[in-house]
């Protein structure tokens, strides 16, 4: 039975040209995390594998940095970075947990962070 929950940074906004940290946290389970995938709807951004270590997709390596922790830092943001991001935790023996973050990249200098929320 999957008992864990993923807490994410939720709906967040950031300024064009700036950077943002995408963070997820898996709690309420003793399952072993074997890999975390960071994905957009159509492609893989990065993986952090217990054995392979961090791997950033080549098309993102100039502006994506691993960490902090299992999170991901997006740099030099553009308006095209607006959209959904998913952290996918592969665990044993529970299976897969997924968290969703919506990032809005704003032209203006006003960028406020959304509230944290949980996905069971």
């Amino acid at each position: 039975m999957m008992t864990g929950t993923i807490e994410t940074t939720g709906n967040i906004s950031a300024e064009k040209g700036g950077s943002i940290i995408l963070q997820c946290h898996l709690s309420s389970t003793t399952a072993q995390v074997t890999q975390v995938n960071w994905e957009q709807q159509d492609q893989l951004l990065a993986i952090c594998n217990a054995d392979l270590g961090w791997h950033i997709s080549p098309s993102f390596k100039d502006r994506v940095a691993p960490g902090p922790g299992l999170g991901l830092t997006l740099q030099s943001l553009t308006v095209n970075d607006t959209g959904e991001y998913f952290c996918i935790y592969h665990t044993y023996p529970d299976g897969t947990y997924t968290g969703r973050i919506f990032l809005e990249v704003l032209e203006s200098s006003v960028a406020e962070h959304g509230a944290r929320f949980q996905i069971p």
Epitope: T34, Q35, N37, E39, Q41, D42, Q43, L44, I47, N49, D51, L52, G53, W54, H55, S57, P58, S59, K61, E84, F86, I88, H90, G95, T96, Y97, T98, G99, R100, I119
Partner: antibody
Framework: QVQLQQPGAELVKPGASVKMSCKAS????????MHWVKQTPGRGLEWIGA????????SYNQKFKGKATLTADKSSSTAYMQLSSLTSEDSAVYYC?????????????WGAGTTVTVSA | DIVMTQSPDSLAVSLGERATINCKSS????????????LAWYQQKPGQPPKLLIY???TRESGVPDRFSGSGSGTDFTLTISSLQAEDVAVYYC?????????FGGGTKLEIK
């Protein structure tokens, strides 16, 4: 264009070891994980494991732990797989395959395969 | 490990007719969080490595003819060739790329009737 070059065949004696190569060209070798797949008429396609050429980190299918050892040489853009204590069960075609940014286990690029024959 | 089961083992279809290959996984390949199915289809011709045809259960890889289509979700998937051509004679494999270890179906041999 992406190319993965593998030697065509290896003939080895039971109990011996074999080290096969996969030379990558047409892309930055350390930017992509390299996977290895075994194919036999009886068992079909089996994923052996993967290596992160940048860090040297490896991940194995439990079934092939102790049988296969994956390494990579960044200077020559070549991935290697060593198989030890060979038996007739190890006679197969072995492919190296590069992953796709749509998924870390998705393989659009394959070597031509190395046919390993274990025979006294 | 996720077990991938294909049916039928072999299939003979007349040129120009429809060919349908099924694949069933022992666990769901649908990630309910992002609504993606981590299922791929490959084509393999004699003496060649597998060729990626479909990923995400239904998205054609670049350069793949539109007579190839994939459908299904969760544990049940289908590869359809709408009008069989002579060059489609091959073995077709489904693959789980949802979780380690990545696993393949046993293959379906497609021949011309």
């Amino acid at each position: 264009q992406v190319q993965l070059q593998q030697p065509g065949a290896e003939l080895v004696k039971p109990g011996a070891s074999v080290k096969m190569s996969c030379k990558a060209s047409g892309y930055a070798f350390t930017d992509y994980l390299m996977h290895w797949v075994k194919q036999t008429p009886g068992r079909g396609l089996e994923w052996i494991g993967a290596i992160n050429p940048g860090s040297g980190g490896t991940s194995y299918n439990q079934k092939f732990k102790g049988k296969a050892t994956l390494t990579a040489d960044k200077s020559s853009s070549t991935a290697y797989m060593q198989l030890s204590s060979l038996t007739s069960e190890d006679s197969a075609v072995y492919y190296c395959a590069r992953y796709h940014y749509y998924g870390s286990g998705l393989f659009p690029y394959w070597g031509a395969g190395t046919t390993v024959t274990v025979s006294a | 490990d996720i077990v991938m089961t294909q049916s039928p083992d072999s299939l003979a279809v007349s040129l120009g007719e429809r060919a349908t290959i099924n694949c069933k996984s022992s666990q769901s390949l649908l990630n309910s969080g992002n609504q993606k199915n981590y299922l791929a289809w490959y084509q393999q011709k004699p003496g060649q490595p597998p060729k990626l045809l479909i990923y995400g259960a239904s998205t054609r890889e670049s350069g793949v003819p539109d007579r190839f289509s994939g459908s299904g979700s969760g544990t049940d998937f289908t590869l359809t060739i709408s009008s069989l051509q002579a060059e489609d004679v091959a073995v077709y494999y489904c693959q789980n790329y949802h979780s380690y270890p990545f696993t393949f179906g046993g293959g379906t041999k497609l021949e011309i009737k």
